[in-house]
């Protein structure tokens, strides 16, 4: 019998530029001789319904038709015909399909690889046009893929050492769309720094399909208006 | 030209075994896999299992492997189908045809069909 | 096991209709499918393979296409010679299975 498995659940994610192995496991009821074996992986973009072979090995040779592709003959003979791609591309996400041939039998699996890029996040105050008291803090969001994403704004106070979503004030923009396929966003909290305690924390959380935890970024409110420090202003918190 | 020129009819009693050749010729031999296909009442057709003369792999479906056993002799470029324990069941047309693409297993020869009749 | 759901089972024709026969697969076989032409008493021939390949000397009026698990097999125009049953296979994955057939008979 001859039998093929994918990755448990049918989908497997990873980062943009990561050197990718898609996994393919081949369960045969006889020791496998390569010599008289074959694996084609075929690729479906999600755009594009069309199937492209990516990789190709049977016995006497092997052939990569996207460069860097690999299956280690080494692996293989013990059942392990996983697929190498270094680099992996956003656009190369879709349906990946193993197909193996132990002649006279053939099995196939299929598995959908989604690539994901995190956010770097950072924050930034903007005190340009403001007036007395207030302050404008902006929670930049960039170079993350898929598109959806989530910000919001929380505080903590001395008086309330729990987290406090906040709701008011806070104007999130459009996502724009980067040159290589990623996403930008800002996230805008208005403040009256009058009518807030002095330590108390704001942070800008940041969720996103790319991130196991959210992505928290935050500053201090002082008792002097505009003392974010610059590590504060600037730094990249991903 | 190819050619697939299998063994006659057979006329045989429940319990019994028989072994069914397909003698080949106008072509390399191991370049090409053996399969045998059953067809029952005219209408349809069961793939039984194919043997690859090469490496001598063997494979069937699940419904046939304690049915039949394929083996081949490459100095008479001759591939044998064995089934036993045989019941009106088995009563059919066998077909032995090859395949010939890596990948693919579509079949480009037929030999005429063995004719096999399970009756008390 | 790849179930193949061949329709119709039986189609009246007469000399220079179109007829188009279905397959569907019981999952994606991407264009791992087959076709066949058997007449009476005589062995399968092969017409069609991966999908829309005619093999060698089949005529063109013969075509198939479908992606999947939609399949049809088409005769543009059909000819006396044509009158036989029609299977389509997958090989997409053993055990290779065919479709029940489909029988071109005089209208």
């Known amino acids: 019998d001859l039998k093929v498995e994918m990755m448990a659940g049918g989908t497997q994610i990873t980062p943009l530029n990561d050197n990718v192995t898609i996994f393919c496991n081949i369960f045969y009821s006889q020791p496998l001789n390569i010599t008289s074996m074959g694996i084609t992986w075929f690729w479906k973009s999600l755009t594009f319904d069309k199937e492209v072979k990516v990789f190709e090995f049977f016995g006497d040779h092997q052939e990569a038709f996207r460069p860097g592709a690999i299956v280690s003959p080494w692996r293989l003979k013990s059942g392990d015909a996983s697929l190498r791609l270094p680099g992996i591309q956003l656009e190369e996400a879709g349906e990946y399909r193993c197909e193996v041939v132990v002649t006279p039998l053939k099995a196939q699996g299929t598995v959908q690889l989604e690539v994901v890029a995190s956010p770097a996040s950072r924050l930034l105050l903007d005190q340009v046009g403001m007036k007395e008291n207030e302050d404008k803090y902006m929670c930049e969001s960039s170079g993350f893929y898929p598109e959806a994403i989530n910000i919001t704004w929380e505080k903590q106070t001395q008086k309330f050492p729990h987290p406090i979503e906040i709701s008011e004030d806070v104007i999130t923009g459009p996502t724009i769309k980067n040159m290589d396929g990623t996403f930008n966003v800002t996230s805008c909290l208005k403040l009256n720094s009058s009518q807030e305690d002095p330590g108390t924390v704001y942070q800008c959380v940041v969720r996103h399909a790319s991130l196991h935890t959210p992505l928290r970024s935050n500053f201090t409110l002082t008792a002097a208006r505009h003392s974010l420090s610059e590590t504060e202003k600037t730094d990249n918190f991903s | 030209e190819v050619q697939l020129q299998q063994s006659g009819p057979e006329l045989l009693k429940p319990g019994a075994s028989v072994k069914i050749s397909c003698k080949t010729s106008?072509?390399?031999?191991?370049?090409?896999?053996m399969h045998w296909v059953k067809q029952s009442h005219g209408k349809s057709l069961e793939w039984i299992g194919g043997i690859n003369p090469n490496y001598d792999n063997t494979g069937y479906s699940e419904k046939f492997k304690d049915k039949a056993t394929l083996t081949v002799d490459k100095s008479s470029s001759t591939a044998y189908m064995e089934l036993r324990s045989l019941t009106s069941e088995d009563s059919a047309v066998y077909y032995c045809?090859?395949?010939?693409?890596?990948?693919?297993?579509?079949?480009?020869?037929w030999g005429q069909g063995t004719t096999l009749t399970v009756s008390s | 096991d790849i179930v193949m759901t061949q329709s119709p089972d039986s189609l009246p024709v007469s000399a220079g209709d179109r007829v188009t026969i279905t397959c569907k697969a019981s999952q994606s076989v991407s264009n791992d499918v087959v076709w066949y032409q058997q007449k009476p008493g005589q062995s399968p021939k092969l017409l069609m393979y991966?999908?829309?390949n005619r093999y060698i000397g089949v005529p063109d009026r013969f075509t198939g296409s479908g992606y999947g698990t939609d399949f049809t097999f088409t005769i543009s125009t059909v000819q006396a010679e044509d009158l036989a049953v029609y299977f389509c296979q997958q090989d997409y994955s053993s055990p290779y299975t065919f479709g029940g057939g489909t029988k071109l008979e005089i209208k």
């Open positions: 045809t090859r395949s010939g693409s890596r990948r693919s297993f579509y079949f480009d020869y």
């Open positions: 106008g072509y390399t031999f191991t370049d090409y896999t």
């Open positions: 991966s999908t829309s």
